[in-house]
């Protein structure tokens, strides 16, 4: 039969709220060298126990009896400390354990999760979370909105998750946790109501250097919109703005619009250039989320200036004209040049030169026409740019280089003539 247990004092019980400090104690009486006392919690040896062992001899001789007291200190009681505690000693070839003591946690509910501050769009559903535990269980939750309970009694309404179908004003939410010991109140979460994301961002009109855009505002609850902000950013093909990418890769052009109307003219843009635009609207509570980036493009315009450095020389029945690309912005893709020449008493002749910047003209009448002048204009798909001032044909002087060019015969009828409104040519020779 087993030897009698050496334990003369067993651990007591501790029950308290979180954070409590307490001590478990066991005492044994042994003959000979005192053993090391180990503590078990739920059968597991506590390796990092905060324990102290005191040994008192009951006689003069080492082989006399000893009283051994082991104390286990529990600081700041937590749920992980709860369980059954025993002292354990190895004596010779035998193992002895004390009677168990119990450590329990009992107090006001303890929050594992509390509602968090957040922003939501007006009239948009969202969820809030709250979780609490005892012991003692059960723990019943009661949600409050702006300090008003959302249920008749704890445990009757929503518990861990509160579904809010939507708000039209900034509100506060908290939850109360109730158990047999009392009530704990969570932190108060502020739910800020922001305007909904604007919808249907679209182009109203396009000019080479400006775009007019409009959008439909989202709901903003009880808070009127104060303004909307529009951003435009140049979009190269390699730029990689995706529909939902949150930030543009370069500093955007930002404009503010007073509202209403929900419309804005964006100026100072580059012609014939792709952009991405987005809009957000702001109330006193803050800004809405941005719309997705919308790809837009400014149209081509006509060149803003005439070709430069026009020179025209005449040698008998031939005239050589050359010029340079306009210095002024082209506002699009240069498609070519138009040239017009006219004598004092002859009809104007219009020609499309294409992209060349020089031409040799074969003049009629063996060069007898007097006071010949030449004008040149550049054009894009949008139309003709301004014509140059008339340049008089100068007589060719020997020693001047005479380039060899394909001759362009002056037609007997003005086949190259264009309606004046088309080529914007209104000069008078």
């Amino acid at each position: 039969q087993a030897e009698e247990s050496p334990f003369v004092g067993n651990p007591g019980n501790i029950t308290g709220a979180r954070g409590l400090t307490g001590t478990l104690r066991c005492q044994l009486q042994v003959q000979g060298e005192p053993p090391e006392v180990h503590w078990l919690r739920d059968g597991q040896i506590l390796e990092l126990a905060d324990s102290t062992q005191t040994q008192v001899p009951l006689g003069e001789d080492e082989q006399d009896d000893w009283i051994v007291v082991s104390q286990l200190r529990i600081t700041s009681l937590q749920l992980s400390d709860t369980g059954q505690y025993q002292c354990l000693v190895f004596l010779g070839h035998q193992t002895f354990v004390s009677q168990p003591g119990y450590v329990g946690l009992e107090g006001l509910p303890y929050f594992l999760e509390e509602p968090e501050d957040r922003t939501v769009a007006a009239n948009t559903p969202f969820n809030l979370s709250c979780q609490a535990q005892g012991p003692p269980e059960p723990v019943d939750l009661l949600w409050l909105q702006d300090a008003v309970p959302l249920a008749t009694a704890p445990g009757h309404g929503p518990q861990r998750s509160l579904h809010v179908p939507g708000l039209n004003k900034t509100s506060s939410f908290s939850c109360e946790a109730h158990n047999a010991k009392g009530v704990t109140t969570s932190r108060t979460a502020t739910i800020t109501v922001l305007p909904q994301q604007p919808r249907n961002l679209h182009l109203v009109s396009r000019q080479p250097t400006e775009l007019e855009v409009a959008w439909t505002p989202g709901l903003s609850g009880i808070y009127p919109l104060t303004h909307c902000t529009l951003q435009a950013v140049l979009s190269d093909d390699g730029m990689g703005i995706q529909a939902g990418e949150p930030d543009p890769p370069e500093e955007p052009l930002t404009s503010q619009a007073s509202v209403p109307p929900h419309q804005l003219r964006l100026g100072s843009l580059h012609p014939h250039t792709p952009y991405h635009i987005r809009v957000a609207c702001t109330s006193s509570q803050g800004p809405s989320s941005w719309t997705h980036w919308l790809p837009v493009e400014t149209p081509e315009g006509v060149p803003l200036g005439p070709p430069e450095n026009i020179s025209a020389t005449r040698n008998g029945s031939q005239a050589f004209v050359h010029w340079q690309e306009p210095r002024a912005p082209l506002q699009g893709t240069l498609l070519g040049y138009r040239l017009a020449y006219q004598g004092q008493d002859t009809p104007e002749v219009l020609m499309d030169i294409g992209l060349r910047q020089e031409v040799t003209l074969e003049l009629q009448g063996d060069g007898s026409v007097s006071n010949l002048t030449v004008c040149v204009a550049a054009y894009t798909a949008a139309g003709d740019g301004p014509w140059s001032l008339p340049v008089p044909l100068e007589a060719w002087r020997p020693g001047q280089a005479q380039p060899v060019h394909q001759l362009v015969k002056e037609p007997s009828t003005p086949a190259f003539s264009w309606p004046h409104h088309h080529h914007h040519h209104h000069h008078h020779h």
């Epitope: 180990h38 059968g43 040896i45 059954q84 354990l88 009677q99 168990p100």
Partner: antibody, heavy 116, light 106 residues
């Protein structure tokens, strides 16, 4: 001296239940935890759970939770392990073992064979 | 859970030789325990609290180690020592065992 004596081998069909017993002697039965350990053929050892006979408190390995039930009858110093919804991979030797922070005494083992 | 890895899986030695069995834990533990199992028998406790000999275990067995690395040493092998040896931890739940080292006669 401490002794743990287990019940004999069992052959069961898949889906059935088995109840293995472990009779303790030579020490105060209610003071020490009784653990159960599984050893599949040619395999290592796997802890199933424990029961404290003094209170009936139990703790289970998550892997076995829901299919295993540990009980005791202190009047006859006997611990029981019941395993339900048996599957072929439950075929193993099941040991009871007394624990004092480790497994100091073991039963002789009970072979449970699950076969259709 | 803490995983215990024993090495070598098999150790072939002759009687009289020294045997060193290793057990490595996947995270730091406070104590290691060792068991011996012979074919057809139940495990038997050898070492507890890392270095203490269990009841009836001869002094040629010893244990050592700390943190993640632990060792069981048999100073001079006897014929009855050829068996499978398991290490075990209970620093964290659930208690786990190593996969075993088989000590066989060379």
């Amino acid at each position: 001296q401490v002794q743990l004596v287990q019940s004999g081998a069992e052959v069961k069909k898949p889906g059935a239940s088995v109840k293995v017993s472990c009779k303790a002697s030579g020490y105060p039965f209610t003071d020490f935890y009784i653990n159960w350990v599984k050893q599949a053929p040619g395999q290592g050892l796997e802890w199933i759970g424990w029961i404290y006979p003094g209170s009936g408190n139990t703790k289970y390995n998550e892997k076995f939770k829901g299919r295993v039930t540990l009980t005791v009858d202190t009047s006859i110093s006997t611990a029981y392990m019941e395993l339900s919804r048996l599957r072929s991979d439950d075929t193993a030797v099941y040991y009871c073992a007394r624990s004092t922070g480790f497994f100091d005494y073991w039963g002789q083992g009970t072979l449970v064979t699950v076969s259709s | 859970e803490i995983v215990l890895t024993q090495s070598p899986a098999t150790l072939s030695l002759s009687p009289g030789e020294r045997a060193t069995l290793s057990c490595s834990a996947s995270s730091s533990i406070g104590y290691m325990y060792w068991y011996q199992q012979k074919p057809g028998q139940s495990p038997r406790s050898l070492i507890y609290l890392t270095s203490n000999l269990a009841s009836g275990i001869p002094a040629r067995f010893s244990g050592s180690g700390s943190g993640t690395d632990y060792t069981l040493t048999i100073s001079s092998l006897e014929p009855e020592d050829f068996a499978v040896y398991y290490c075990q931890q209970w620093s964290s739940n659930p208690p786990t065992f190593g996969q075993g080292t088989k000590l066989e006669i060379k």
